[in-house]
């Protein structure tokens, strides 16, 4: 058993049918010695008396808020949560496996630049009685500071019969140098509590591997005289690291017909302009990627040919 | 510890081309190693990230763009002095700080070159003959060093008398390649910045 926060405790259980569970001793936080009784949650049934209460925690029915009283007055509370270990592996019931970029990906993180700021998000089908707490650091043995905000509900989607909820959090490395070569990964730890179930999820990454630039901005077309060709131009996104000559991007320009089946013409360039043939009803899209370290491409910025 | 914004003549920066070749070569070699050594811990998540140049060179700090010198997190206190007769910029405007940066890059390349050559000698003794260093990568390191054209003492190739542990050597190869790829990215960024300056 360990303390998650004041008066909240996590009991780790080897989870299998007929398991013996864990013996837990609760102590009433009071100088009183006599006349103390214990109850669980809203029940008035007295579970025991005395300054300590010994319980065998086996299932969720044994978890909850234990309260010690004296003469009708509440003395203290202890909330017991359960953390299930199923055949040597901690349970992952609360969050959905996003399966991207690989199986067992519960937390996904992205950074728009090298400033040390990043966003992580996760999915769940649970709508109520759910709380998250996020901590982060650079490295784990001698951790350096990363400050994370509160996790917030960022999107709701309907997936088949289920509603899916997306939560996200923003974090910022306390002293980040955009030009630094990372040797210790960022560690992100999310504590999830649903009713009386506790779970924790972790992700470990280098900022360089989670970079996804914003789409190029100010995408414009300039028709070339006496030609079906157009000059496409764009700019680096505002959120990208500076100076741009050091943090350079490379770009992919795509001409896409109205029908998805039509052949796509693609051009790759390090410049912020390109000359392409604009077909009727087609659209021109441009996306960006770090020129020197191949992390994710940005989303497309698009303009219609007409 | 920063790069001044100099204005070299256009087309006077041969190192940019060489550094791009270097990044391509080390990335290809790393990809090959990850595929060939699939049963070894060779992914970024599995290896220890070690920097063999740590405390010996300070390329990131010496080559810091001017715009980042205001960022206190970028200003590391390590002081290292380097030889200052680089010729990558065929221009007399090469400043002391730029020379410091380029000589730091040269020292990095020299250290990696020695490590890779030593490692290749061990890998050639492996009866499995599973993986060797790409000669193209070694040649590209050499070309960039020549383009940087610094006079520096030659470092003797390390020779080891004991029987090599091929498993450890292959894991060390992965560690070296990951670190060298990261350094090659920095070198490319620096060359791109200098070229635009």
């Amino acid at each position: 058993i360990w303390e998650l926060k004041k008066d909240v405790y996590v009991v780790e259980l080897d989870w299998y049918p007929d398991a013996p569970g864990e013996m837990v001793v609760l102590t009433c936080d009071t100088p009183e010695e006599d006349g103390i009784t214990w109850t669980l949650d809203q029940s008035s049934e007295v579970l025991g008396s005395g300054k300590t209460l010994t319980i065998q925690v086996k299932e969720f029915g044994d978890a909850g808020q234990y309260t010690c009283h004296k003469g009708g007055e509440v003395l203290s509370h202890s909330l017991l949560l359960l953390h299930k270990k199923e055949d040597g592996i901690w349970s992952t019931d609360i969050l959905k496996d996003q399966k991207e970029p690989k199986n067992k990906t519960f937390l996904r993180c992205e950074a728009k630049n090298y400033s040390g700021r990043f966003t992580c998000w996760w999915l769940t089908t649970i709508s109520t009685d759910l709380t998250f707490s996020v901590k982060s650091s650079r490295g784990s043995s001698d951790p350096q500071g990363v400050t994370c905000g509160a996790a917030t509900l960022s999107a709701e989607r309907v997936r088949g019969d289920n509603k899916e909820y997306e939560y996200s959090v923003e974090c910022q490395e306390d002293s980040a140098c955009p030009a630094a070569e990372e040797s210790l990964p960022i560690e992100v730890m999310v504590d999830a509590v649903h009713k009386l179930k506790y779970e924790n999820y972790t992700s470990s990454f280098f900022i360089r591997d989670i970079i996804k630039p914003d789409p190029p901005k100010n995408l414009q077309l300039k028709p070339l005289k006496n030609s079906r060709q157009v000059e496409v131009s764009w700019e680096y996104p505002d959120t990208w690291s500076t100076p741009h000559s050091y943090f350079s991007l490379t770009f992919c320009v795509q001409v896409q017909g109205k029908s998805k089946r039509e052949k796509k013409d693609r051009v790759f360039t390090d410049k912020t302009s390109a000359t392409v043939i604009c077909r009727k009803n087609a659209s021109i899209s441009v996306r960006a990627q770090d020129r020197y370290y191949s992390s994710s491409w940005s989303e497309w910025a698009s303009v219609p040919c007409s | 510890r920063n790069l001044p914004v100099a204005t070299p003549d256009p087309g006077m920066f041969p190192c940019l081309h060489h550094s791009q070749n270097l990044l391509r070569a080390v990335s290809n070699m790393l990809q090959k190693a990850r595929q060939t050594l699939e049963f070894y811990p060779c992914t970024s998540e599995e290896i220890d990230h070690e920097d063999i140049t740590k405390d010996k060179t300070s390329t990131v700090e010496a080559c810091l763009p001017l715009e980042l010198t205001k960022n206190e997190s970028c200003l590391n206190s390590r002081e290292t002095s380097f030889i200052t007769n680089g010729s990558c910029l065929a221009s007399r405007k090469t400043s002391f700080m730029m020379a410091l940066c380029l000589s730091s890059i040269y020292e990095d390349l020299k250290m990696y070159q020695v490590e890779f050559k030593t490692m290749n000698a061990k890998l050639l003794m492996d009866p499995k003959r599973q993986i060797f260093l790409d000669q193209n990568m070694l040649a590209v390191i050499d070309e960039l060093m020549q383009a940087l054209n610094f006079n520096s003492e030659t470092v003797p190739q390390k020779s080891s008398l004991e029987e090599p542990d091929f498993y450890k050597t292959k894991i060390k190869l992965c560690i070296l390649l990951h670190a060298f790829r990261i350094r090659a990215v920095t070198i490319d960024r620096v060359m791109s910045y200098l070229n635009a300056s």
């Epitope: 080897d14 989870w15 049918p17 398991a19 199923e86 055949d87 040597g88 592996i89 019931d93 | -």
Partner: antibody, heavy 115, light 112 residues
Framework: QVQLVQSGGGVVQPGRSLRLSCAAS????????MHWVRQAPGKGLEWVAF????????YYADSVKGRFTISRDNSKNTLYLQMKSLRAEDTAVYYC????????WGQGTMVTVSS | SYVLTQPPSVSGTPGQRVTISCSGG????????VKWYQQLPGTAPKLLIY???QRPSGVPDRFSGSKSGTSASLAITGVQAEDEADYYC????????????FGTGTKVTVLG
């Protein structure tokens, strides 16, 4: 004590369907994940499918994906395996089993796919 | 499609020490715990070892398990006639959990 009693096996023609059941007693069935495992005659053990305690997630072996469906009825304390488009290579003894460091197995039920 | 490899058979005379190996990889045994099962003819498998080296109550102490790196092994110290059976190791793969990964199985024969 924990008990898993299986039923539903038998002889079936290729292409036909069969449903296996596994009735649980002696524990809170709705709290635990459950597996199906099979063993072809003279062969080793092969995992078939898994279902979470609340039925929210199901996982299948590639060899049965799209043909077999694992389900559970927590109000009846019963686990099911619906098998469709059966093939000769599905011939095996099928076991249900609890998920956990200490597990309990059903007695097994024989499924023979033969024309 | 078995990823955990066991020797097809091992044998020993009563009282001898018999060991069965189970060889896997970094993503399975290297990252997860190992179980061992005993299966007597015509019966369901019976758990002998869980979490690499733990014995459930009721399993004789002549059975012991160990794990090192990407391999595990089961030892029967002082093998007895009633130990003649098939033995299977089981683990998980970190990418496909909770799918069970079983070993190829080993037939233990007690001679004489």
């Amino acid at each position: 004590q924990v008990q898993l009693v299986q039923s539903g096996g038998g002889v079936v023609q290729p292409g036909r369907s069969l449903r296996l059941s596994c009735a649980a007693s002696g524990f809170t069935f709705s709290s635990y994940g459950m597996h199906w495992v099979r063993q072809a005659p003279g062969k080793g053990l092969e995992w078939v499918a898994f279902i979470r305690y609340d039925g929210s997630n199901k996982y299948y072996a590639d060899s049965v994906k799209g043909r077999f469906t694992i389900s559970r009825d927590n109000s009846k304390n019963t686990l099911y395996l619906q098998m469709k488009s059966l093939r000769a290579e599905d011939t095996a003894v099928y076991y249900c089993k609890t998920h956990g460091s200490h597990d309990n197995w059903g007695q097994g039920t024989m499924v023979t796919v033969s024309s | 499609s078995y990823v955990l490899t066991q020797p097809p058979s091992v044998s020993g005379t009563p009282g001898q020490r018999v060991t069965i190996s189970c060889s896997g990889g970094r993503s399975n045994i290297g990252s997860n715990t190992v179980k061992w099962y005993q299966q007597l003819p015509g019966t369901a498998p019976k758990l002998l070892i869980y979490q690499n080296d733990q014995r459930p109550s009721g399993v004789p102490d002549r059975f012991s398990g160990s794990k090192s790196g990407t391999s595990a092994s089961l030892a029967i110290t002082g093998v007895q006639a009633e130990d003649e059976a098939d033995y299977y190791c089981q683990s998980y793969d970190r990418g496909t959990h909770p799918a069970l990964l079983f070993g190829t199985g080993t037939k233990v024969t007690v001679l004489g």
